[in-house]
């Protein structure tokens, strides 16, 4: 039985050209996290964080995706095309897969303020 819950940074906004941190946290389970995958709205993989082996940033994103903090991901040099859904997928044993959703809005306005909060989707 899957007892865990994923907390995420929820809906966030950030300035074009700036950076943003995507964060997820798995709680309420004793399952072993073997891998965390970060995916974009079109289901392309951004990065994999393997529990033992560390980070693999996908080649297409190497120049503007940075690992961390923690199991999170930092997106840099944001463009308007980065607006959309992001998913953290926790692969665990023996529970299986947990998935969290974050919506990022990239704003043109120079006065756009980065807003973030942890929430349970």
């Amino acid at each position: 039985m899957m007892t865990g819950t994923i907390e995420t940074t929820g809906n966030i906004s950030a300035k074009k050209g700036g950076s943003v941190i995507l964060q997820c946290h798995l709680s309420s389970t004793m399952a072993q996290v073997t891998q965390v995958n970060w995916e974009q709205h079109d289901h392309s993989l951004l990065a994999i964080r393997n529990a033992e082996l560390g980070w693999h940033i996908y080649p297409a994103f190497k120049d503007r995706v940075a690992p961390g903090p923690g199991l999170g991901l930092t997106l840099q040099s944001l463009t308007m095309n980065d607006t959309g859904e992001y998913f953290c997928t926790y692969h665990t044993y023996p529970d299986g897969t947990y998935r969290g959703r974050i919506f990022l809005e990239v704003l043109e306005s120079s006065v756009a303020e980065h807003s973030a909060r942890f929430q349970i989707p």
Epitope: N37, E52, G54, W55, Y58
Partner: antibody, heavy 120, light 107 residues
Framework: EVQLQESGPGLVKPSETLSLTCAVS????????WNWIRQPPGKKLEWMGY???????YYNPSLKSRITISRDTSKNQFSLKLSSVTAADTAVYYC??????????????WGQGTTVTVSS | DIVMTQTPLSLSVTPGQPASISCKAS??????VAWYQQKPGQSPQLMIY???YRYTGVPDRFSGSGSGTDFTLKISRVEAEDVGVYYC?????????FGGGTKVEIK
Amino acid sequence: EVQLQESGPGLVKPSETLSLTCAVSGYSITSDSWNWIRQPPGKKLEWMGYISYSGNTYYNPSLKSRITISRDTSKNQFSLKLSSVTAADTAVYYCARLDFSNYGGAVDYWGQGTTVTVSS
Amino acid sequence: DIVMTQTPLSLSVTPGQPASISCKASQNVRTAVAWYQQKPGQSPQLMIYSASYRYTGVPDRFSGSGSGTDFTLKISRVEAEDVGVYYCQQYYTTPWTFGGGTKVEIK
């Protein structure tokens, strides 16, 4: 260049423990991930598990109760032990390196493989 | 575990002609797929990673494509040295799993 060489007995009796060693040259096993992969006759390649640069291990759940992967950094080698073997463990066994940072779970260096037969 | 299914089982190709190998995943693996070539009497060699990126030294006649559940390895012009068995592998989630292989032969 990275080179891997498997060694160990080619014949193991049922219920005994299969033991193989992989000697690594041209690269330190305190970097990257060091894997065992096998292929039974006529079947798919099966990833068995790995030991990481830090010495942590991860095993395929299908083998978890029988498999141990360890390392000897002074000899730059790592080893596989598989207990309670049956005929189903007859396979070509490969040791392999995986550079996770650059290639994810894709294996970039393989040993030449060693055939192990389980038979009485 | 994720099951990787390759088609066809074997392929006989005239030199200079193209060849295409398919790999289907039992669930969405995004682009976490690698392809290997195993020549007769040798161990597998990495050809493609992240579904479409050629590994160092791999000739540009080899290309990988696909995402989600359907992946393809293409050889634009088959040469005699391309004979062997080709395997796909997913690393979207552990345990990482392989396809059953496709044998490429020369006519």
